[in-house]
């Protein structure tokens, strides 16, 4: 595979060619990690240290800000607890979600005292409202972590907040919570490593199972320590966890705890020369490509190796049908003389643990209606035995010979002359963005990756910690500790002044229009456009 980018652009080149706009942060802020894209309002909301920003998607230089620090008393309490005054004793925004048509919901670490509030954004973009609801602050426990170093995954749907976070000052009680709303808060079982074992939460997504909304599930992506016996030595496993949206806990056991929580391992590996697979286990980011069928998004995962000796990154793709198949498969069960993990062979209670209660399914209207045996089984069997393997059983992108690792991913589906292509924008820990197109060979899932561009988007090398893509604006937005960057999804003119160069680039966004390499629009007249993504063959497509 061709690992040399067609274009490699330094930060200076990006600036000079007007291909990057940067917001270099405020002197009293940092950690621009929490993104919320609002295409309707044409805003990018960003949570940072002591601030929440509202950037204009057209140009991020145009922004509004809310200052939301902690009180001096709170900051001093944090300092007295032995925490770093600059890096920890501030309000680092960890949750930023659309609450309803007029408000956002935001939570921050609150100097090791999590706090949440509502932000008014008005009914219409032209209202130009962006203000903190100063009169209404809520306890942020179970919503935001105490420690800004900890990752949080959250999702706000129907007035309920799902959060994967640490619920204590020490950062040991990790859980998946559901808070807000009218129901009692629900969480994963406490102090049970079979459920969660020192997890690092990545993201949460609502995915429909069927046309019946009672079957909707919330999926959490995270990485965690492998449980003893799953792996020799200390190891990390990437996970996908599921929870039914209509889970209200058990009636006696697992009261106010999830009864439908299940998790499975995500495998992203390549066969090694010695017959031992090289595993990319450190899940860093996930992107769901919804196309046509929202019930079956393609899951893109960015992974890195756990090893300090061998540094590598990979992107793996997963299908939801494979995920569901694993969740319908055998449960992991500890048995035998060595107490090792085996597939559970016994009788699985009815209704099968992990199944969402629904009127159409056996008349179990609520998880509170489940019999004791279902609950006891669910409590002791939260993990599936089989892992989820990636499409085609291998990564679609691998990088092992470089001084950086992948951190973030967003994907755009692009219409080209010869079909549709997924273009990946991959963020790295040195502040570069890779633009990679996956090109189908014989079958659509047997893919060839072509590295189109490598762009440096920040002045200093800094890890990219957030990325959003606006299809409307055709722009990419990137967050780091240092600030926020904006760049267009395509730079067709940089590919050169000849048809052959444009064709060889194999960039689905670009085509030769007869006089220049420019943005390809599928609606334009076919005869005047030269493009060949699949083969990159200029001989057939360029007459010059």
């Amino acid at each position: 595979k061709n690992n040399v980018p067609r274009l490699k652009l330094s930060y200076k080149e990006m600036l000079e060619s007007n291909n990057v706009i940067t917001f270099n942060g405020l002197a009293n802020s940092s950690s621009y990690h929490t993104f919320l894209l609002d295409e309707e309002r044409s805003r990018l909301y960003v949570g940072a240290k002591d601030h929440i920003f509202s950037f204009d998607l057209v140009n991020i230089k145009d922004f509004q800000k809310i200052v939301w620090p902690v009180s001096y008393t709170r900051r001093d309490e944090c300092k007295w607890a032995g925490k770093d005054i600059l890096k920890e004793c501030a309000n680092f925004i960890k949750v930023l979600k659309a609450y309803n048509q007029t408000h956002l919901y935001a939570c921050g670490t609150g100097a090791f005292h999590p706090i949440c509030t509502y932000i008014e954004i008005g009914h219409h973009p032209e209202d130009n409202i962006f203000k903190l609801e100063n009169s209404h602050f809520e306890n942020g426990r179970g919503k935001s972590p105490y420690d800004p170093k900890l990752l949080t995954a959250s999702l706000l749907i129907d007035g309920e907040l799902y959060s994967g976070t640490a619920a204590d000052f020490m950062g040991r009680d990790f859980a998946i919570f559901r808070t807000l709303g009218h129901h009692h808060p629900i969480r994963t079982e406490q102090h049970d490593s079979r459920w969660l074992n020192d997890p690092k939460f990545i993201s949460a997504h609502l995915i429909s199972e069927s046309d019946n909304p009672e079957d909707d599930k919330v999926y959490f992506f995270f990485r965690e320590n492998a449980i003893d016996g799953e792996h020799s030595g200390k190891a990390t496993h990437a996970r996908i966890g599921q929870i039914c949206k209509n889970d209200f806990g058990g009636h006696r056991s697992l009261v106010n705890k999830w009864t439908t929580f299940l998790k499975a391992r995500l495998i992203c590996s390549v066969p090694g020369p010695n017959g031992i697979d090289t595993h990319f286990d450190e899940l860093q980011d996930v992107f769901l490509m919804n196309f046509k069928d929202p019930k079956n998004p393609v899951v893109y995962g960015v992974f890195t190796t756990s090893s300090n000796i061998f540094k590598g990154s990979a992107v793996c793709m997963y299908s939801m049908s494979d995920v569901r198949r694993v969740f319908l498969g055998p449960y992991a069960h500890r048995d035998g003389p060595n107490y090792q993990w085996v597939p559970y062979q016994g009788r699985v209670p009815y209704p099968r643990p992990g199944t969402c209660p629904s009127k159409t399914f056996g008349g179990f209207d609520s998880t509170k209606d489940l019999p004791d045996d279902v609950i006891t089984f669910a409590r002791s069997h939260p993990a599936m035995y089989n892992p989820v393997f990636p499409m085609n059983n291998r990564p679609i992108v691998i990088k092992t010979d470089v001084n950086y690792q992948f951190t973030q991913i967003v994907v755009d589906r692009v219409d080209a002359e010869d079909g549709q292509y997924d273009v990946m924008f991959i963020g790295t820990d040195v502040g570069t963005v890779l633009k990679v197109v996956s090109i189908p060979k014989e079958t659509w899932y047997d893919l060839e990756e072509v590295l189109l561009e490598e762009m440096t988007v920040f002045r200093e090398p800094t890890a990219i910690s957030a990325m959003e893509l606006s299809t409307k604006q055709q722009q990419l937005y990137i967050g780091s500790t240092a600030g926020v960057a904006q760049l267009p999804l395509h730079r067709c003119d940089i590919y050169g002044k000849a048809c052959a160069e444009c064709c060889l680039a194999r960039d689905p966004y670009c085509a030769w229009d007869g006089s220049a390499c420019s943005r390809y629009f599928p609606t334009a007249k076919r005869a005047t456009r030269a493009q060949d993504i699949r083969n990159g063959d200029p001989l057939t497509h360029c007459s010059d």
Partner: antibody, heavy 117, light 107 residues
């Protein structure tokens, strides 16, 4: 006060059928699992069936599976047990019981079923 | 299925004495064990649920303990009306099963 009153018991021929009923009062019938438990003369207790609140699913031991059917009418606060292909070993006092999701907290006085050859 | 074994089959004691009834499960059932009392010609009644939870209306002299596979029903000081048959029942998994019963008789 919770009351469970069974009816429908009696003498039945081997291979015959019988339908037991249980009229419930004093509690919100539709909010609880309901069960049937039996006791053969001079013997211990044996669980026969449990039905969930909505009536949409039921549980049975192998000894009665495919022969007995538990059902409920939440509008009438009534529990039923349809017994087919009756055997001599089905002779017992049949108790209607409130519960079955957890413990069985209230029991009727029972109705006697005798299967004769 | 889970087999519950009750011991002793018969226990002969005098009023005022302490009674200890045992129930052993063939596999671990957590605390999913319930105790019932049955007097001749009457329906059973629930005494203790989930191994140790007491029921309102049941005298305080009745208590339950245990978890996993070994469970105990204790009657601290026997009253004449306590002489009956006692059954344990597991609600851990279907099929629900009862123990064979312990007959508590007056010595």
């Amino acid at each position: 006060e919770v009351q469970l009153v069974e009816s429908g018991g009696g003498l039945v021929q081997l291979g015959g059928s019988l339908r037991l009923s249980c009229a419930a009062s004093g509690f919100t019938f539709s909010s609880y699992y309901m069960s049937w438990v039996r006791q053969a003369p001079g013997k211990g207790l044996e669980w026969v069936s449990t039905i969930i609140k909505s009536g949409g699913y039921a549980y049975y031991p192998d000894s009665v599976k495919d022969r007995f059917t538990i059902s409920r009418d939440n509008s009438k606060n009534t529990l039923y047990l349809q017994m087919n292909s009756l055997r001599a070993e089905d002779t017992a006092v049949y108790y209607c019981v409130k519960g079955g999701q957890g413990a069985m907290d209230y029991w009727g006085q029972g109705t006697t079923v005798t299967v004769s050859s | 299925e889970i087999v519950l074994t009750q011991s002793p089959a018969t226990l002969s004691l005098s009023p005022g004495e302490r009674a200890t009834l045992s129930c052993r499960a063939s596999q671990s059932i957590g605390d999913y064990l319930h105790w019932y009392q049955q007097k001749p010609g009457q329906a059973p009644r629930l005494l203790i649920y989930y191994a140790s939870q007491s029921i309102s209306g049941i005298p305080a002299r009745f208590s339950g303990s245990g978890s996993g596979t070994d469970f105990t029903l204790t009657i601290s000081s026997l009253e004449p009306e306590d002489f009956a048959v006692y059954y344990c029942q597991q609600g851990y998994s279907f099929p629900y099963t009862f123990g064979g019963g312990t007959k508590l008789e007056i010595k």
